[in-house]
Each structure stands twice: as C-alpha cells, then as structure tokens.
C-alpha cells in the first residue's frame, strides 16, 4: 500500500517537475546584441546591419540563434523586441556629404517559409546637421510586442550606416520572450 | 493508512507551494522611479541624478532598494531597464547659456565589488535651441535587457540637468526582472 | 484504499492545475494596437486618438479589451506600457500651417470609478520643419512599468494628429502584463 502511494506521489512529482520546466518556458529565450564596429558599411544608403556581437560585454544570447546578421527565433512565443540606434559625427572624422539627413531604423522580420521581409517597427528623424557644427549626435529607440514563430528572423536596417555610434551602450537591439502562444 | 496518505499529500503540497513561490521568483523585483524636482542640480555639465521618488504617484519599488540616488539590485536576474528623460526650456525661465546643446542620458551600472561604473545605455541628441523661440522640448527614451547581480547599482547621468522636465510622466527610469540567471 | 488514494491524487492534481493556470496568470494579458489611418483627426491641436486596429497585421489583443478608442484592463497587475508615434510631412501633401511644431505624445490612464485622466508617460520634441525641405520625419518612443487595475483605461493623445505616419510599423502602442499585484 505504502509502496503504491509512493509510486503515485512520484507520478505527481514527475508531472509537476515537467510543468515547472514548462512554466519556465524551457528557459525563456532572450538576446541583446551590440554593434560590431569593425564591419559597419559605409555610405548614406539604407542597409541591413549584419555584424553584431552576441557574447562580449553587454551582448548575450540564450535559446535564440545569431546567424548571417540575423537573430533567429528558436521558440514560438510573444516577444518584446527593442532597438537603440545612435548616430554621431565629429568634424575630425571628415565631412558630411549632405547636411540634410534621414536617420532611420527599421526592425524587420523575415519568414523562411514565405521568403518575404516585413517591417515590424520603424523610427528616426530628418535632421539638419550643419557642417559648421563640430559635433552631432542623435539616438532612436523603438520597442514593441510581437508574435514570433520558430525559424523567423529579426534584422536591423538603418540609413547612413557610416554615422553609427560604435559603442555597445549606443547601438544595440534585443528581444526577450514574455509568454507562450495560446 | 489514510493519515499516512494525507502526510504524503502534505509533502507534495508543501514542496509545490515552494516551487510556486520560486516560480514567482520570490515576487519579481521591479522599480519605477520618478524625478524629484526639489533637488535637480543646476548647470549644463554631465551629472548623476540622485533624487528620485520611489513611493508617490507612479513611482514604486518592490524587491529592489533605492539608496543614495541609486537603484540597488537585491536579486540576481535578467532585467529590462528603461529610462525616459525630458528636457524643456521656456523663455520666461531665463536665457539659455548657449543655443547649442547636447541633451544626453546615460544609464550606468556600478558594482560594489569592483568599484567601477559602466554605461549600459545612452541616448540623446545635439540640439539648436534658438533664443528666438518661446519654448523648447525634447525627450529621450532608452531601454535594454541586462544581467544584473545582487548588490549592483543602477544610476542615471544626464547633461544639462537644469533643463530637466520635473513632471513624473516626463523624467523617470525603471527596471523589472524578466527571468532568472540559468 | 486504492480508490481513496486516487481521490487524494486527483485533489492534488486539481489544485496544482489551478496553480499552474494561475502561475501563467490566467494567460498573461497583452495588446499591440496599430493606428487606423482611415480616421485620424485633422488639425494641430492635442487630441485623443480613438481609432486603432487590434486584429490585423501586427495588431493583436488578449485578455484586454479595446473599446471606444481605449485599451481596457481586464486583469489587475503590473504592466509594461509602450508607445511609438511617428510624424511625417512631404511637400506634395501641402504646406505646413507653421514651421514651428510641438510633436508630442501622452499616454494616459483613466479610472472609471474616479472619472479622471492622468498622464503616465509623455515624450516628444519641438521641431523646426522648414518649408524649404522636401520631407520631414520624427518618431517618439516612450515606455514604462505601471500598476493597472481591472477597468482602468489606457489612451493615447498626440499633438498635430494630421502629421501622423499611418503605417502599422510607425504608430502603435501596447501593453503586456509582467506580474501580479502582491
């Protein structure tokens, strides 16, 4: 009798350990990726940024994958996505091609099944950066809550990539899972 | 027999109550701190803001500590940190020392073990606030996901503190724990 | 005896299924609402934006209600609230009434019990949008962590609504529940 009870309890314990693991959602995925300044494209055109750190300084990743410049979702869920993009120019680093700039960021989602890219969030500003000013700076922050499926990819596009601030506290993006899909 | 079964159930219940508490992560820490306008430093230089409310209006704190102008982490974990900083100037409050401003925020982390400060996030803009305009306003928002250890401290530095908007909806920062460290 | 044990186990299982549901916080509420461009007010005055999508494109809602232009809380808790508001103007769409603009967003909370509205977050900038420039753009992002009670309503007010960018990736707001109220 007692042995039988212990077996029953073991079943309860076992199922609840499973539930506990699931309640931690298989260890919630997250990523915080910081710009890799050694490989920032030049020019003023809109480009996809492909070089990001995922394992140094503030950069980290868990239960997500970084590959070919894209943050890949490994686990279905609702995620909070964010990006902080800083642009800067000092006259000692050269001249601006134009004083009228569109400083923009686009957070995009690509589905491999349907090879199309969609913009989830955008932000930025048109700026007049006079050539007579010694230093210019501008930051953009965007954030939002999105349903992401395993295999979908998040990437960052910016205008004027040559003006990006290469500091890890300046130019970064990330995601963390908040909840399962019902 | 029946008494023995109840004891077994109590053990199961007890252990799962513990697990439930842990699954709530000892009540997830958070803080939302709003600027204390009675003690904003003057000048245009970069300063650490030490006066924040933690228990009035929108300001609140739980399982974190506010001390000496810093938000102290009491529980290891991954946290989402954010800050919203508003700057404003009206001509009725006097002239600006200069029309060319760097309006910046820096969210910094200090470890007591290694007494050094590191910037986690920065944002802002260079601005031309003409003396001919009656009113100027500008807001910065930054946010990101960071690993924080118990005892680490979060603080806010800004340039031009005398231009800060003192409203609780304007100038604030905060944090909430998202998940444990594996 | 064996039947009695099974009944005890069923009680344990039942209570823990309840706890499991509660640990998922009755399925965490969230919303991501995107601007409905077919009904944006004109003018430059400050207005409440009442037309938002909740079920198309990136827009979605769960365990919250959208009614009369307001996001209604159905479940007490601490929520992260956010808004991203983009303003834009192209010379092909006509002249600006003034080149000096205040581009602002206010995230407000209304309690039905006490019919008063309070601003939780604000952001924006004064801008000089010269008539000599072909295109202008500016985005605001705000976010913060707030205690919300069932029945409370979140709404968005902006200045210069006629300048809003109608894209779903540009102008949106949202919320997700992070934790229960103790």
């Amino acid at each position: 009798g007692s042995q039988h009870i212990r077996a029953e309890k073991a079943m309860v314990d076992g199922s609840w350990l499973d539930l506990a693991k699931r309640s931690k959602l298989e260890a919630q995925p997250f990523a915080h990726l910081t710009i890799n300044a050694t490989d920032i494209p030049s020019g003023s055109h809109k480009v996809s940024l492909s070089s990001w750190y995922h394992d140094r300084g503030w950069a980290k990743i868990s239960n997500m994958t970084f590959s070919n410049g894209k943050l890949i979702v490994n686990q279905d869920g609702f995620y909070y996505l964010y990006a902080n993009i800083c642009f800067r120019h000092h006259e000692t680093s050269g001249d601006l091609a134009t004083e009228y700039l569109q400083l923009m960021v686009y957070v995009t989602k690509t589905s491999i099944k349907i090879p199309s890219s969609h913009t989830l969030m955008k932000g930025g500003s048109t700026k007049y950066w006079s050539g007579n000013s010694e230093f210019h700076f501008y930051s953009i922050n965007v954030g939002g809550f999105f349903k992401l499926r395993s295999g979908e990819e998040i990437s960052i596009e910016v205008s004027n990539p040559s003006l990006l601030d290469p500091d890890q506290d300046a130019t970064y993006f990330g995601a963390f899972k908040v909840r399962d899909i019902d | 027999g029946s008494q023995h079964i109840r004891a077994e159930k109590a053990m199961v219940d007890g252990s799962w109550l513990d697990l439930a508490k842990r699954s709530k992560l000892e009540a997830q820490p958070f803080a939302h701190l709003t600027i204390n306008a009675t003690d904003i430093p003057s000048g245009s230089h970069k300063v650490s803001l030490s006066s924040w409310y933690h228990d009035r209006g929108w300001a609140k704190i739980s399982n974190m500590t506010f001390s000496n102008g810093k938000l102290i982490v009491n529980q290891d974990g991954f946290y989402y940190l954010y800050a919203n900083i508003c700057f404003r100037h009206h001509e009725t409050s006097g002239d600006l020392a200069t029309e060319y401003l760097q309006l910046m925020v820096y969210v910094t982390k200090t470890s007591i073990k290694i007494p050094s400060s590191h910037t986690l996030m920065k944002g802002g803009s260079t601005k031309y606030w003409s003396g001919n305009s009656e009113f100027h306003f500008y807001s910065i928002n930054v946010g990101g996901f960071f690993k924080l250890r118990s005892g680490e401290e979060i603080s806010i530095e800004v340039s031009n503190p005398s231009l800060l908007d003192p409203d609780q909806d304007a100038t604030y920062f905060g944090a909430f724990k998202v998940r444990d460290i594996d | 005896g064996s039947q009695h044990i099974r009944a005890e186990k069923a009680m344990v299982d039942g209570s823990w299924l309840d706890l499991a549901k509660r640990s998922k916080l009755e399925a965490q509420p969230f919303a991501h609402l995107t601007i409905n461009a077919t009904d944006i007010p004109s003018g430059s005055h400050k207005v409440s934006l009442s037309s938002w999508y909740h079920d198309r494109g990136w827009a979605k809602i769960s365990n919250m209600t959208f009614s009369n232009g307001k996001l209604i809380v159905n479940q007490d808790g601490f929520y992260y609230l956010y808004a991203n508001i983009c303003f834009r103007h192209h010379e092909t769409s006509g002249d600006l009434a003034t080149e000096y603009l205040q581009l602002m967003v206010y995230v407000t909370k209304t309690s039905i019990k006490i019919p008063s509205s309070h601003t939780l977050m604000k952001g924006g900038s004064t801008k000089y949008w010269s008539g000599n420039s072909e295109f202008h753009f500016y985005s605001i992002n705000v976010g913060g962590f707030f205690k919300l009670r069932s029945g409370e309503e979140i709404s968005i007010e902006v200045s210069n609504p006629s300048l809003l960018d109608p894209d779903q990736d540009a102008t949106y707001f949202g919320a997700f529940k992070v934790r229960d109220i103790d």
């Epitope: 001249d95 091609a97 006079s130 007579n132 | 029309e99 | -």
Partner: antibody, heavy 118, light 111 residues
C-alpha cells in the same frame, strides 16, 4: 600623410576646354570635400567649388557654374575639374585642396598652371 | 556672397616689430558658437599655407608669434615679432557659408 598630386601644366586656346586631375592619398578619399581654388597671375585666391566623392555631391561658385564641372573617380582616389569655353582671363594656377581635421584648408596640391592664349 | 575686405593692402614692418592685418566680413561668419575665419600665408611660387583656423587656433607647426582674434565680422591676424621668413602675402578666408570666399590679400614686406 595627406598628399594631393596634380596633373601638369596646360596650354590652351580660347574657347577650348581643359581637364585637370588631383590624386589624393594618405586619407579616405570619400570622407572629405575636395575643393578647387584658382589664382590668376599677381592676383588673389578665388574659391571655385568642391566635390564630395562617393555620392558625387558638388557645389560651385555662381560665377563658374555654367562652364565648370567637378567629378571624381573613387576607384582611383582622383578628382577632376573641367573648365569649358576658356578665356584669357582663365589663365591661372589651379589648386586642389582639402580642409584640415578642424577646419581651414590645411592641404593643398602643388598647383597646375593653365595658360589660355591664342 | 560674403565679401572679405583686407586692410592694409600692403605693409612694411621692421624685423622684430609687430604686424597687424585686419579682415572685415560683409556679414557675420559666426555660427554654432564658432567663427569660421581662417588665415593663410603664401610665399611667391608656393601654395598657400594655413596659419590660423577658426579665428584664433594656431595650426600645428606654425610659430607661436602668429595669433588670430575677432568674431562675427571683424578679425585680426597678428605677428608679434616679425622675422625675415614672414615676408609673404596673407589671406583671410571664410567657410561659414557657400561659396567660400577669400580676402584680397595683404602683402607684408620686411624693412
């Protein structure tokens, strides 16, 4: 170090065109405006215009706008200036130049003498 | 266009004496808290050489006897103690707005 090396002297007839080159080295060619300045014999310095290599943005003094063109070949880190419908008063030394890191024209080519004579 | 008027057109100074050259702009060349006025020296047969940038900053390698001052529309180049090698023509230039312009030049002769 920054160097600007210009092409050799030119003798042209009135009404003809001249194209001068300026090869840059010692810095990233696509990050600074390259300017052209001329100096007629015994006269002062006269700013003509400039180019931002890469996108090829240009700016010109009104006086020269109709017959003056500046171009650049980024693959060769070389800028060119062409002046059409030459007149005798276009006889001058033509300099290419670049600003210093903190303003002012710190770097000058050696100059190219253009003589316009029938 | 901003017109720069230099005076005098020429001056003769004894070795070791002070030389002062003036440059007046037809409108302010100040913006963003700085004065966009620069000074050059040109010796015969040579390209100009930058002496002073942004009204008062000494270019690297230029002797400390050269100095610049002024703001808005009135600027001065001073050589505190003239040396023989300073015999040259001096030009002011503004790059506050397009088109950039030069002054007519001042010829310095050493007595």
């Amino acid at each position: 170090q920054v160097q600007l090396v210009q092409s050799g002297a030119e003798l042209k007839k009135p009404g003809a065109s001249v194209k001068l080159s300026c090869k840059a080295s010692g810095y990233t060619f696509t990050t600074y405006w390259l300017q052209w300045v001329r100096q007629a014999p015994g006269q002062g310095l006269e700013w003509m215009g400039a180019i931002y290599p890469g996108p090829g943005n240009t700016k010109y003094t009104q006086k020269f706008k109709d017959r003056f063109t500046i171009t650049a070949d980024t693959s060769k880190s070389t800028a060119y200036m062409q002046l059409n419908s030459l007149k005798s008063e276009d006889s001058a030394v033509y300099y290419c130049a670049r600003r210093g890191s903190r303003r002012g024209i710190a770097y000058w080519g050696q100059g190219t003498l253009v003589t316009v004579s029938a | 266009n901003i017109v720069l008027t230099q005076s005098p057109a020429s001056l003769s100074v004894s070795l070791g004496q002070r030389a002062t050259i003036s440059c007046r702009a037809s409108e302010s060349v100040d913006s963003y808290g700085r004065s966009f006025m620069h000074w050059y020296q040109q010796r015969p047969g040579q390209a100009p050489k930058l002496l002073i940038y942004l009204a008062s900053n000494l270019e690297s390698g230029v002797p400390a006897r050269f100095s610049g001052s002024g703001s808005r529309t009135d600027f001065t180049l001073t050589i505190s103690s003239v040396e023989a090698e300073d015999e040259a023509t001096y030009y002011c230039q503004q790059d506050n707005e397009d088109p950039y312009t030069f002054g007519g030049g001042t010829k310095l002769e050493i007595k």
